[in-house]
């Protein structure tokens, strides 16, 4: 049930058990008798099939190949092809730091405020079968954690935890010992504290329309990392199939806060969709913002005061 | 504090069914609530959300896959899904609509994955 290596381009170091998986697996199963070939090819070489007889150290299981372990020279590109897919990875395999329990290119960087919940799990599922134990170290130290198959951090974040945890997992492949570094980065700051999310512009907003055509209602806000904006209009769904809600889209501020923007399209416009109440709403734990649109035909707008139009 | 807990994730091929649960410590006889999922490099985003009433809406992406339901006298919200496609992988949450969120849950993990 391992996800299959959509990556296109993979770094990893070497001296590692590693492997790639395709990702047409579950097609392959249906097709047993199909030829399934894998290929590498890498500046002079072009397109040379893989098999276990070209290396020792590369093992073939029905939808993966694996390294045992993955060296400098297998950098290049693969290919898996099976009847007309094709998948392609670009790998490059980077020198392992001799001086170091990790290699500062594989470094997953992490920011977790102080208080807040923060937690390390050593797993690997792939591999899982075959590690023998696990041990994290922090800073290239090792901590004596209880478990020694899947070694766990779990607290409240302090300042003291900042640093470089390794999970290391060590297993046994054919009589032979191999082990595999994930690194964190883990940086601890300051508690960036909340702002009350707010809708930008007017509360109430009517919009001149005409029937027949589309309109787009633009709603936008300043909130936190968590908090959500969404659009409200008429409970039962399937009443308007023109009404549709467009991704989400967010830049962060140089605050650390995030400047959001969704859309709510309205297509063909019809009597329906006049004089009726849409909703954005801005929510937060400690409380929401709403912004409200009304469609009105144009013909119309001479009824109403010119400043309160959006468009 | 309101609790929220979320449960029923997990890893699932593509096609196959879901059915998430979210129990609260709060009466949701008359709160608007929702189901929320956020996935790997997004943001947090509502997906479906029913009335106290039992009106539903659902975004075009989960359209005719998704059911949303809920149970007051258990003040649990459910999220039936079908037909899971690759890009429904995310971490699902559950929460009240149009009123001040309560505090997130730690959310149920679902991966679409062949």
């Known amino acids: 049930a391992e996800s299959c290596t959509s990556r296109p381009h993979i770094t990893v170091v070497e001296g590692e058990p590693f492997y790639l998986k395709h990702c047409s697996c579950s097609l392959a199963h249906e097709i047993e008798t199909t030829t399934k070939s894998w290929y590498k090819s890498s500046g002079s070489q072009e397109h040379v099939e893989l098999n276990p007889r070209s290396s020792s150290r590369i093992a073939l299981h029905d939808c993966v190949l694996e390294f045992w372990p993955v060296e400098l020279n297998d950098t290049g590109s693969y290919f898996f092809q099976m009847k007309n897919y094709t998948q392609k990875w670009k790998l490059n395999v980077i020198r392992r730091n001799k001086h170091s329990c990790f290699t500062e290119r594989q470094v997953t960087s992490k920011i977790v405020e102080v208080k807040k919940f923060f937690q390390i799990t050593c797993e690997n599922s792939y591999y899982q079968t075959l590690v023998n134990s696990t041990s994290l170290y922090k800073n290239c130290k090792k901590l004596l954690l209880e478990n020694n198959k899947n070694p766990t951090i779990k607290k409240n974040a302090e300042f003291e935890d900042q640093g470089y945890y390794s999970c290391v997992h060590f297993l046994h492949h054919n009589g032979k010992l191999f082990n595999i570094t994930k690194t964190f980065n883990i940086t601890i700051v300051e508690d960036r504290s909340n702002i009350v999310p707010v809708l930008l512009g007017p509360k109430l907003n009517h919009v001149a329309v005409e029937l027949g055509k589309n309109v787009r209602l633009n709603c936008s806000a300043l909130l936190n990392e968590e908090d959500v904006i969404y659009w409200m209009f008429g409970e039962e769904n399937g009443s308007d199939p023109n009404i549709h809600e467009e991704k989400e889209m967010r830049i962060m501020t140089p605050e650390g806060k995030w400047h959001a923007s969704k859309v709510l399209r309205i297509e063909n416009i019809g009597e329906s969709n006049l004089n009726v109440l849409y909703n954005c709403t801005v929510a937060s734990t400690g409380g929401t913002d709403t912004k409200s649109f009304i469609l009105v035909r144009k013909a119309d707008m001479a009824d109403i005061p010119g400043h309160v139009f959006t468009r | 504090e309101v609790q929220l807990v979320e449960s029923g994730g997990g890893l699932v091929q593509p096609g196959g069914s879901l059915r998430l649960s979210c129990a609260t410590s709060e009466s949701i006889f008359s709160l608007n609530m929702g189901w929320f999922r956020q996935g790997p490099g997004k943001h947090r985003e509502l997906v479906a959300r029913i009335s106290p009433a039992g009106s539903t809406y659902y975004v075009d992406s989960v359209k005719g896959r998704f059911a949303i339901s809920r149970d007051n006298a258990k003040n649990t919200v459910y999220l039936q899904m079908n037909s899971l496609k690759p890009e429904d992988t995310a971490v699902y949450y559950c929460?009240?609509?149009?009123?001040?969120?309560?505090?997130w849950g730690q959310g149920t993990q679902v991966t679409v994955s062949s």
């Open positions: 929460n009240r609509v149009n009123t001040a969120l309560a505090p």
